[in-house]
């Protein structure tokens, strides 16, 4: 049993059938010896009496907030989350496998540049009584500070006859050095909290692996006289890392018929303007991606050819 | 040439062996699905990689600043890695085909220390390991190992010399 | 902590094939080298062979060639031996065990020496 | 394959005595890619020396390693209660990596 936070313990139960379950020990806090009594959540039944408390968690139906009383006045609470173990391996049913980039991707994060913030979110099925805390660190054996906001649901989906809620957090190194060469990973841990459940969920990565910018801004054709070339040209995102002399991208400049089959003509570049030619109908697409480590492309930008 | 206190490097040439180099190192070493590489420390856990940290002055501030920290730094690692790429990790089981990017990697690394470093002048460079590991599939494991990290090294020389063609050539 | 967790005893018949499976918590199971090591009643130990999850490549001792298979499943971080045309001899505890971190520079590497090992599966071969 | 014979079979001494196990390879352990395991009746073996002389975490500094090539040592300064085991040496220079056939130390 350990202390997530105050008055609140998580007990670690081998989760398997007629498993003997964990012996806690509850001590009401208060100056007083005699005539204490216990209950557990709203029920006025007693379940001992005394400065302590033993009893054996097994089940779901063990936990919840035990409160000690002395003639009808509360003196303090003890609230006991399980955390089940099965076949050695930690509970997974709060969040949902995103399975992207691999399986078993709970959390995943991206920064938009190399400022040290970045953003994490995960999926749940779950809409009530659910609580979520995060925390994260620069390495983990002599951690470096870094600070996150609260968790909020950014989304909801319907996903058949389900529906899915998507919650996010934002997170700053605290004192992030940009040009620096990571050596040491970014650990972001999660605790999850669903009724009597708790779950917690980690991601470790290095900042560089999680860049994805924006999409190029101010996308603008130039038609060429008597040709049916245009001139594209597009400037670097807001959110972009700067000098852009020294954190530079590279571009992709794509043209698209109406039609999804029709052949895609692709133009790499890493000035911020292209020649390409615009046939009727098509749309003309910019994405960008950090030129000198292959991290993520941007979503597109994109204009009509007409 | 980068000489220690003295002239600046050639910019333009570096920007551009840089580049290839980042290039190089990605094609030797794309990402596959996404592997996971971490590393786990423990007691007797010592980095002797040379990283670009952030008191190297390889910040833009940094190299307006004065460029020779940074660039003894980058040479540091160069000459690291070309070590590495020269030793029985890479050369031993299983072998790597002659021209593989690995091979042209090798040599550019090379080629961008000795850029930066004239002959008969010295800084200090880290020593490789000596004791080298016996199966042909931890040799594999630590060269992907070393791949990644030398993408993420190379990275920041590019950036660098980029910034320094842009800003500081005379 | 980091725990290999091995599945339970199994009795069977000569010529019949058998799985024993080891599941770790916690720690990087990719990139570590799994081997079976394997003890008769009575006797030292044998190494068997081994995998890295990571590459799903294992390699085995010559006496065991083409008689077993070492798996590894990184979804649910579990390594699997099987062992089939099994005859009396075979009758042994089976131990999965991990591999203890190398540095060689600034990474580690899975040397051959075994720093965590599993609870072993006993398999009986008897008719 | 590489063949390690350690010696001897069965050492009995007292607590408090040293004990001197050797274990002795066919053919010469490169990079000193040797190893020294403790087994107990019942257990699984735990990792005492690695690279022939350096300690695992959390063993005890009586236990220490020595040798190069084709012969090798494992010495317990002075043996505690919990010393008594059986003790195996392994090679992991060559596949197949191969254990020494064992030395029990047992209470005299």
């Known amino acids: 049993i350990w202390e997530l936070k105050k008055d609140v313990y998580v007990v670690e139960l081998d989760w398997y059938p007629d498993a003997p379950g964990e012996m806690v020990v509850l001590t009401c806090d208060t100056p007083e010896e005699d005539g204490i009594t216990w209950t557990l959540d709203q029920s006025s039944e007693v379940l001992g009496s005394g400065k302590t408390l033993t009893i054996q968690v097994k089940e779901f139906g063990d936990a919840g907030q035990y409160t000690c009383h002395k003639g009808g006045e509360v003196l303090s609470h003890s609230l006991l989350l399980l955390h089940k173990k099965e076949d050695g391996i930690w509970s997974t049913d709060i969040l949902k496998d995103q399975k992207e980039p691999k399986n078993k991707t709970f959390l995943r994060c991206e920064a938009k540049n190399y400022s040290g913030r970045f953003t994490c979110w995960w999926l749940t099925t779950i809409s009530t009584d659910l609580t979520f805390s995060v925390k994260s660190s620069r390495g983990s054996s002599d951690p470096q500070g870094v600070t996150c906001g609260a968790a909020t649901l950014s989304a909801e989906r319907v996903r058949g006859d389900n529906k899915e809620y998507e919650y996010s957090v934002e997170c700053q190194e605290d004192s992030a050095c940009p040009a620096a060469e990571e050596s040491l990973p970014i650990e972001v841990m999660v605790d999850a909290v669903h009724k009597l459940k708790y779950e917690n969920y980690t991601s470790s990565f290095f900042i560089r692996d999680i860049i994805k910018p924006d999409p190029p801004k101010n996308l603008q054709l130039k038609p060429l006289k008597n040709s049916r070339q245009v001139e594209v040209s597009w400037e670097y995102p807001d959110t972009w890392s700067t000098p852009h002399s020294y954190f530079s991208l590279t571009f992709c400049v794509q043209v698209q018929g109406k039609s999804k089959r029709e052949k895609k003509d692709r133009v790499f570049t890493d000035k911020t303007s292209a020649t390409v030619i615009c046939r009727k109908n098509a749309s003309i697409s910019v994405r960008a991606q950090d030129r000198y480590y292959s991290s993520s492309w941007s979503e597109w930008a994109s204009v009509p050819c007409s | 040439r980068a000489v220690p206190g003295g002239s600046s490097p050639a910019w333009t040439q570096c920007q551009q062996l840089s580049q290839k180099l980042c290039t190089l190192a990605w094609s030797a070493h794309p990402l596959v699905g996404h592997m996971d590489l971490r590393e786990e420390g423990d007691e007797e856990t010592t980095n002797d990689v040379p990283h670009i940290q952030c008191g190297d002055g390889c910040d833009p501030q940094g190299l307006r600043d004065n460029s020779q920290f940074c660039l003894q730094r980058i040479h540091q690692g160069l000459i690291f890695y070309e070590k590495l790429l020269g030793s029985d990790i890479f050369t031993g089981e299983p072998s790597l085909l002659p021209d593989s990017p690995v091979a042209q990697l090798h040599a550019s690394l090379l080629g961008l220390s000795q850029l930066l470093q004239p002959e008969g002048h010295h800084w200090e460079t880290q020593q490789i390991p000596s004791l080298s590991p016996s199966q042909p599939w931890q040799r594999l494991l630590l060269r992907f190992k070393i791949l990644r990290s030398l993408q993420a090294f190379v990275a920041v020389a590019a950036r660098v010399f980029a910034h320094g063609a842009a800003t500081l050539s005379p | 902590q980091v725990q290999l967790v091995q599945s339970g005893a199994e009795v069977k018949k000569p010529g019949s094939s058998v799985k024993v499976s080891c599941k770790a918590s916690?720690?990087?199971?990719?990139?570590?080298?799994i081997s079976w090591v394997r003890q008769a009643p009575g006797q030292g130990l044998e190494w068997m062979g081994g995998i890295i999850p990571i590459f799903g490549h294992a390699n085995y001792a010559q006496k065991f060639q083409g008689r077993v298979t070492i798996t590894a499943d990184e979804s649910t971080s579990t390594a699997y031996m099987e062992l089939s045309s099994l005859r009396s001899e075979d009758t042994a505890v089976y131990y999965c065990?991990?591999?203890?971190?190398?540095?060689?520079?600034?990474?580690?590497?899975?040397?051959?020496?075994?720093?965590?090992w599993g609870q072993g599966t006993l398999v009986t071969v008897s008719s | 394959d590489i063949v390690l014979t350690q010696s001897p079979a069965t050492l009995s001494l007292s607590p408090g005595e040293r004990a001197t196990l050797s274990c002795r390879a066919s053919?010469?352990?490169?990079?000193?890619?040797l190893a020294w395991y403790q087994q107990k009746p019942g257990q699984a073996p735990r990792l005492l020396i690695y690279y022939a002389s350096r300690r695992a975490t959390g063993v005890p500094a009586r236990f220490s390693g020595s040798g190069s090539g084709t012969d090798f040592t494992l010495t317990i300064s002075s043996l505690e209660p919990e010393d008594f085991a059986t003790y195996y040496c392994q090679q992991t220079s060559n596949t197949p990596f191969t254990f020494g056939q064992g030395t029990k130390v047992e209470i005299k």
């Open positions: 916690g720690g990087t199971f990719s990139s570590n080298y």
């Open positions: 065990a991990r591999s203890k971190k190398g540095m060689y520079g600034g990474w580690t590497y899975p040397l051959m020496m075994f720093d965590l």
């Open positions: 053919q010469s352990v490169s990079s000193n890619y």
